[in-house]
Interface confidence: low
């Protein structure tokens, strides 16, 4: 195969819920023609599956391929360079992809005013690719977690946390006016897997939402 | 390579002026978030500031608000800390965070992915 190529320097997957990309940094004065070679492995099942023979991006969508993730026991992944007819030796990720290393996510954060209370639903993820009977909920059945963070505007970035355990949260603003913004970092309480914070909602409180009781 | 280099840190008595830099690798400096923590001896690592790359918005926490100021310089893949009116308790080593794929405002040190080695901060009174 003539001069051998180097090996892709790291392999490693980013994976929120039903959304699984392989990454991989790209090897050192690669030519135009340079391209990569994927293959996937799958736990229980000990042989290599070519995924892709040439990929010219640093990352490749493997969650069509690894739908039973939430019911196996995990996947690993390997890439090497590929330039004519030279190869690279195969870069293996160097932990299991299982159900762990799934970052938490929510859909959204859905907020609205109710006598001076923000009250607040958080919608799960729902994926295109998940099978149908593959949600959240059903997947990550018990101790669902949310934290919750509350900035008031103006306010100068002055923070309020919250832990809740349910989809549902209200928020006592005491009898302030002004925006507030919202954002939720998901967990559950028997797993270790990281959560991402949620893009920030906000919604105004005005005088006209409070109700003036003697 | 991904990496954050800081430097700046010494010793300084109270109420002097100090500026932290810390230098990111490219691929680092395109992240959303940068920040500066600190940690002192058996304390957690707290959050001071966090900037905003892409706008520039900042955040600090309450014990340094009016004291302490976070920057970027683009051009140079730069964060700055400036840091005024010092006290003793901000005596700590400080280290500058990036991460690369959240949208947190929250000073959290486990939502910062990549972290510098830290340059330490006397403060004598």
């Known amino acids: 195969h003539g001069t051998e190529l180097p090996s892709p320097p790291s392999v490693w997957f980013e994976a929120e819920f039903f959304h699984h990309i392989l990454h991989w940094t790209p090897i050192p004065n690669q030519s135009e023609s340079t391209c990569y070679e994927v293959a996937l492995l799958r736990y229980g099942i000990e042989s290599w599956n070519s995924i892709s023979n040439c990929s010219q991006t640093l990352s490749y969508d493997l969650t069509a391929v690894t739908l039973d993730l939430y019911h196996s026991n995990g996947y690993r992944a390997r890439v090497r360079a590929v330039d004519g007819s030279r190869h690279s030796n195969w870069t293996v990720t160097n932990t299991r992809f299982s159900v762990d290393e799934v970052t938490l996510t929510v859909g959204s954060v859905n907020l609205e005013i109710h006598n001076g209370f923000i009250l607040g639903k958080i919608q799960l993820p729902r994926p295109k690719m998940a099978p149908a009977n593959d949600t959240y909920e059903s997947i990550f059945s018990h101790f669902r977690e949310y934290e919750i963070a509350i900035r008031k505007v103006p306010g100068n970035f002055t923070f309020t946390h919250k832990k809740v355990k349910h989809e549902n949260f209200s928020l006592l603003t005491s009898g302030e006016v002004g925006e507030f913004c919202v954002q939720v970092k998901p967990s559950v309480a028997s797993r270790s897997n990281k959560g991402m914070w949620s893009k920030e909602e906000c919604i105004s409180l005005t005088r006209q939402y409070f109700t003036v009781t003697n | 390579q991904v990496q954050l280099q800081e430097s700046g840190g010494g010793s300084i008595q109270a109420g002097g002026s100090l500026r932290l830099s810390c230098v990111a690798s490219?691929?680092?400096?395109?992240?959303?978030?940068m920040a500066w923590f600190r940690q002192s001896p058996g304390k957690e690592r707290e959050a001071v500031a966090v900037?905003?790359?892409?706008?520039?918005?900042?955040l600090y926490t309450d014990s340094v608000k009016g004291r302490f100021t976070i920057s970027q310089d683009n051009a140079k893949m730069t964060v700055y800390l400036q840091m005024n009116r010092l006290k003793s308790e901000d005596t700590a080593m400080y280290y500058c965070?990036?991460?690369?794929?959240?949208?947190?405002?929250?000073?959290?040190?486990?939502?910062?992915?990549?972290w510098g080695q830290g340059t330490q901060v006397t403060v004598s009174s």
């Open positions: 490219r691929y680092l400096y395109s992240t959303n978030y």
């Open positions: 965070a990036a991460v690369r794929k959240t949208d947190s405002y929250l000073f959290d040190a486990q939502s910062f992915t990549y």
């Open positions: 900037i905003y790359t892409a706008s520039g918005a900042t």
